[in-house]
Interface confidence: medium
């Protein structure tokens, strides 16, 4: 479907959120990674808000183009253009079974548009099984819950988030492919709004059923750090967040919605070049443990606790945080062993209404981002106890920051 004259330079029908009327966009200020390199022979691959800045050793440039980094939730491997594996990671959608490939005509002809897609398999994202995702024209995928209006600026998979406008050219398409074990979104020959003369970008994100995420870049016609973020955030990486409902001080019967970005990986944008690729391999999380014994004996980088009433293993920092607090799981787990739970009946679970969200040990693991749904200014809130850039790089993944109360 070709756009009509003037089409594609604005939003258009897509699917996704559900609210009556117009809701103001969440104008989120993009935070840049500090970008410092601690030693001359070390390469900083990314900014990891879960575990601080990690600088991994790499071999000299002429010997390898692979950089590995550990981010608590994922291990990322960056493959440069000369690394053969970067070509292997590219999924040739044109060669795929045609019945499994779809050109999204709405996304392909519009700007600042997003549309929901249901996967054919459960995709584990930060340990959470997801079936619905929301593809955006701007080179990224929203991983939030659309149905409950909780698609946020802090739950994304972004091979290259930028101000792409597929509506600029008839050759620009947003294509997706699902064969039951991998879901691929390809932004094909898309142009940056206002920078069309730089040429077109072609890249993809692949979500594998085992939780692996691959970013593959075919055509990147300009230096990514040079892309302006004044009209749209520019970033490459992953982010996840959870939502907390707190009583609103102004309206006692209402609850204030706050979003806590508990982990983010931001790749070094200068590493995003033509024929490069990044592979994120998920690390084990508390959520995968299905029994108390497995949970308490796990040797992860997280402090896993077992909540008997929910029959769930968690660090307390995942999308189920609200439930974890409502059911008093933080207190329940304190100093208890699995044997202590054996005589208890967990079928009669109901939230502990006397349990206040403020009672829990709500602390940050390095840095946090709050988006308060009732604020009228910029919705982004940095951890007030963090450094000037909102990052606490001196903390290890298990280090706790200063407790922060959510809401304002």
């Amino acid at each position: 479907l070709s756009p009509q004259p003037g089409a594609g330079h604005d939003e258009g029908p897509g699917s996704g959120w559900a609210a009556k009327g117009t809701v103001r966009g969440w104008n989120r200020r993009a935070r840049e990674s500090p970008g410092h390199v601690s030693e001359p022979d070390r390469t900083q691959l990314s900014q990891d808000l879960g575990g601080g800045t990690l600088a991994m050793d790499t071999l000299p440039d002429n010997r390898t183009r692979v950089v590995e980094d550990n981010h608590s939730y994922y291990v990322s491997r960056l493959y440069g253009p000369s690394e053969p594996h970067s070509r292997e990671l590219w999924v040739d959608v044109a060669e795929a079974n045609r019945s499994q490939v779809k050109i999204h005509t709405i996304l392909s002809n519009t700007h600042r548009q997003a549309s929901r897609v249901v996967l054919s398999f459960d995709f584990p994202f930060y340990g959470h099984p997801l079936r619905q995702i929301t593809i955006a024209t701007g080179g990224f995928i929203f991983m939030g819950d659309v149905i409950h209006r909780m698609l946020t600026a802090t739950q994304y998979v972004a091979p290259l988030m930028a101000n792409f406008n597929p509506g600029y050219s008839d050759n620009s398409t947003v294509v997706y492919f699902d064969n039951g074990t991998v879901f691929v979104v390809q932004w094909d020959h898309v142009y940056l709004q206002g920078w069309e003369d730089k040429g077109s970008f072609t890249f993809q994100a692949a979500l594998h059923h085992d939780g692996r995420i691959v970013f593959a870049y075919k055509e990147i016609p300009m230096s990514v750090p040079e892309i302006s973020s004044s009209q749209h955030p520019v970033k490459t990486g992953l982010s996840d967040a959870f939502m907390i409902l707190n009583p609103s001080p102004d309206v006692p019967e209402s609850r204030r919605r706050s979003i806590f970005e508990y982990h983010r990986i931001e790749l070094d944008p200068s590493k995003v070049t033509s024929m490069s690729a990044v592979e994120f391999t998920p690390l084990p999380t508390c959520l995968q443990h299905r029994s108390c014994d497995a949970c308490m004996s796990s040797d992860l980088t997280f402090n896993c606790s077992w909540c008997h009433v929910l029959q769930r293993c968690s660090s307390g920092f995942d999308r189920y945080r609200q439930e974890w607090m409502d059911y008093g799981c933080a207190q329940e787990a304190e100093g208890r062993m699995c044997e202590d739970f054996q005589d208890e009946d967990h079928d009669s679970a109901s939230p502990d209404t006397s349990f206040s969200p403020y009672d829990g040990d709500l602390t940050t693991t390095s840095s946090s981002l709050f988006i308060d749904s009732l604020t009228t200014e910029d919705d982004t809130k940095l951890n007030p106890y963090a450094g000037g850039d909102g990052l606490q790089n001196n903390l290890s993944p298990k280090t706790k920051g200063t407790p922060v109360h959510l809401g304002t």
């Epitope: 258009g12 699917s15 996704g16 959120w17 519009t110 997003a114």
Partner: antibody, heavy 126, light 107 residues
Framework: EVQLLESGGGLVQPGGSLRLSCAAS????????MSWVRQAPGKGLEWVST???????YYADSVKGRFTISRDNSKNTLYLQMNSLRAEDTAVYYC????????????????????WGQGTLVTVSS | EIVMTQSPATLSVSPGERATLSCRAS??????LAWYQQKPGQAPRLLIY???TRATGIPARFSGSGSGTEFTLTISSLQSEDFAVYYC?????????FGQGTKVEIK
């Protein structure tokens, strides 16, 4: 109160032209994409055209090249210029507001038509 | 284009009874589907969007379900004001398309 009020319908001969208007009130017109949907007598609903906030347009194949959708945000009015009219264009034409809202980074989401006008009848007959 | 097919064309139900309307898409529209109600001489009214979310002010007796190509609108206990024509509409792809409608009449 949110309202849409269509006008401009009437009897026209095949090959003739007509311009429909839709006056919007009770909401910020410029914030919304707007559409025309028609319904032939005794038949179902058929989407005709959509115009976005920034004037990007889409048309059903059956009207492409003959109909032009436009808007005047200063007058809170939506228009549909219909040329080369055919008998099969006979219908009640509804003006509809796209149900939509804006998410992170001002991304746009559409989920149907949430406000409709009362409709204006266009009859194409010789 | 995506063809939307509704069944049955007419459904005769007694007040207080349950009504189940079906809508089938010629290809997957995921959950990008809306339901509308239209009474004679009136404009349509949005009932359900995203396949299962009730629009503002719509009574709880209306519920939507389904994903992909098969969708259902259920009216749990028909009231006199519910007798009307119901349309489904997909918004997964251009052109936006409606089903041909199901008329719910008094038995």
């Amino acid at each position: 109160e949110v309202q849409l009020l269509e006008s401009g319908g009437g009897l026209v001969q095949p090959g003739g032209s007509l311009r429909l208007s839709c006056a919007a009130s009770g909401f910020t017109f410029s914030n919304y994409a707007m559409s025309w949907v028609r319904q032939a007598p005794g038949k179902g609903l058929e989407w005709v055209s959509t115009i976005y906030r920034g004037a990007g347009t889409y048309y059903a194949d059956s009207v492409k090249g003959r109909f032009t959708i436009s808007r005047d945000n200063s007058k809170n009015t939506l228009y549909l210029q219909m040329n080369s009219l055919r008998a099969e264009d006979t219908a009640v034409y509804y003006c509809a507001r796209d149900a939509s809202w804006y998410g992170p980074f001002s991304y746009y989401y559409y989920y149907g038509f949430d406000v409709w006008g009362q409709g204006t009848l266009v009859t194409v007959s010789s | 284009e995506i063809v939307m097919t509704q069944s049955p064309a007419t459904l005769s139900v007694s007040p207080g009874e349950r009504a189940t309307l079906s809508c089938r898409a010629s290809q997957s529209v995921y959950t990008n589907l809306a339901w509308y109600q239209q009474k004679p001489g009136q404009a349509p009214r949005l009932l359900i969007y995203d396949a299962s979310t009730r629009a503002t002010g719509i009574p709880a007796r209306f519920s939507g379900s389904g994903s992909g190509t098969e969708f259902t609108l259920t009216i749990s206990s028909l009231q006199s004001e519910d007798f009307a024509v119901y349309y489904c509409q997909q918004y997964n792809d251009w052109p936006l398309t409606f089903g041909q409608g199901t008329k719910v009449e008094i038995k």
